[in-house]
Interface confidence: low
């Protein structure tokens, strides 16, 4: 999905009002310096691409974040403010339903959510210069 045509300001507002708080809740009990940020993004469409990937794609050691509160709110924001996004997610959602598992917060998931926090912060500062 190409995130170029999303309403970035509306997504930013959704992040600031609620998603950011859910991410902090998920990370409660971990130090802010515990994980190094190894994922970055260069502009807002790129940031949303990476946010979607880390939020909804299963990875080794962290099977699924998609049922977390921040993920459901992220999905809702993208569906509302990115034209055509919800249609592209139908197949992905059906696949998710088939492999729903017991929720376990692993260290790998905490690391992944830490990366997500960094991506969201970058999304909110699109004019920062990057090497």
């Amino acid at each position: 999905y190409d995130f170029t045509n999303c309403d970035f300001e509306k997504i930013k507002a959704a992040y600031l009002s609620t998603i950011s708080k859910d991410l902090i809740t998920y990370m409660s009990g971990t130090k802010s310096t515990e994980f190094n940020n190894t994922v970055s993004c260069s502009n807002r469409p790129h940031c949303l691409t990476e946010i979607q990937s880390l939020t909804f794609n299963p990875t080794a050691g962290c099977a699924s974040l998609a049922k977390e509160m921040f993920a459901m709110k992220t999905k809702a924001a993208l569906a509302i403010w990115c034209p055509g996004y919800s249609e592209t997610q139908i197949n992905a959602t059906q696949a998710m339903k088939k492999r729903r598992k017991r929720k376990v917060t692993t260290n790998k998931c905490l690391e992944q959510v830490s990366q997500l926090q960094g991506l969201w912060r970058r999304f909110n500062r699109p004019l920062l210069k990057q090497q």
Epitope: F35, N36, T38, S42, P45, E50, S53, L54, E111
Partner: antibody, heavy 118, light 108 residues
């Protein structure tokens, strides 16, 4: 069919500059990024930088002062400008198309050889 | 900057044998950002495996990838003559990309 074709390589004097072109087909530069990667003779791959659909760029931190990546969407061409060339810049220069904004390079050009020598 | 170190530098095996190539990252990586390429002399690199374990289009299923954190592996279950080449691991989320130094797989 996605294709990338590099051109502009050749012999360059030390201290000189190069401007390479990457002509693309099968996709639009308005929406897709292109990366540059080089390979010195007998050596490994080195990422140089990227230009994205919206025109934003990223560069290898060690080369940022000597490197400029630009594009002309209407000509479906991406350019790599590199200044103050030295012998160690001798390499085959490739352009590559990433999958979306990822670092997954599924499509590569054939490469163009740049030799820096007096 | 994340540094990728590949081992061994050269691997000498015979057709039919199993090859195991390693890639170690200087700090922990999401498995979404680790990819493998094959390169033969005089050719551009070819994408083999993306996001740690997914086979690229047209790649035979004797190739597989695994790993997490800092340690990743490319395995070729049964070597064919055309598999002898240089293999590179690569990391990056599209910016600040780095490659390993490569592993040369040669015929014993």
């Amino acid at each position: 069919e996605v294709q990338l074709v590099e051109s502009g390589g050749g012999l360059v004097q030390p201290g000189g500059s190069l401007r390479l072109s990457c002509s693309v087909s099968g996709f639009s530069l308005t929406y897709s990024g292109v990366n540059w990667v080089r390979q010195a003779p007998g050596k490994g791959l080195e990422w140089l930088g990227a230009i994205w659909g919206d025109g934003s760029t990223n560069y290898h931190s060690a080369l940022i002062s000597r490197l400029t990546i630009s594009k002309d969407n209407s000509k479906s061409t991406v350019y790599l400008q590199m200044n103050s060339l030295r012998a160690e810049d001798t390499a085959v220069y490739y352009c590559a198309k990433p999958d979306g904004y990822s670092g997954i390079f599924a499509y590569w050009g054939q490469g163009t050889l740049v030799t820096v020598s007096s | 900057e994340i540094v990728l170190t590949q081992s061994p530098g050269t691997l000498s095996l015979s057709p039919g044998e199993r090859a195991t190539l390693s890639c170690s990252a200087s700090s922990s990586l999401s498995s979404n950002y680790l990819h493998w390429y094959q390169q033969k002399p005089g050719q551009a690199p070819r994408l083999l495996i993306y996001r740690t374990s997914n086979l690229a289009s047209g790649v035979p299923d004797r190739f597989s990838g695994s790993g997490s954190g800092t340690d990743f592996t490319l395995t070729i279950s049964r070597l064919e003559p055309e598999d002898f080449a240089v293999y590179y691991c690569q990391q990056g989320s599209g910016i600040l990309v780095t490659f390993g130094q490569g592993t040369k797989l040669e015929i014993k």
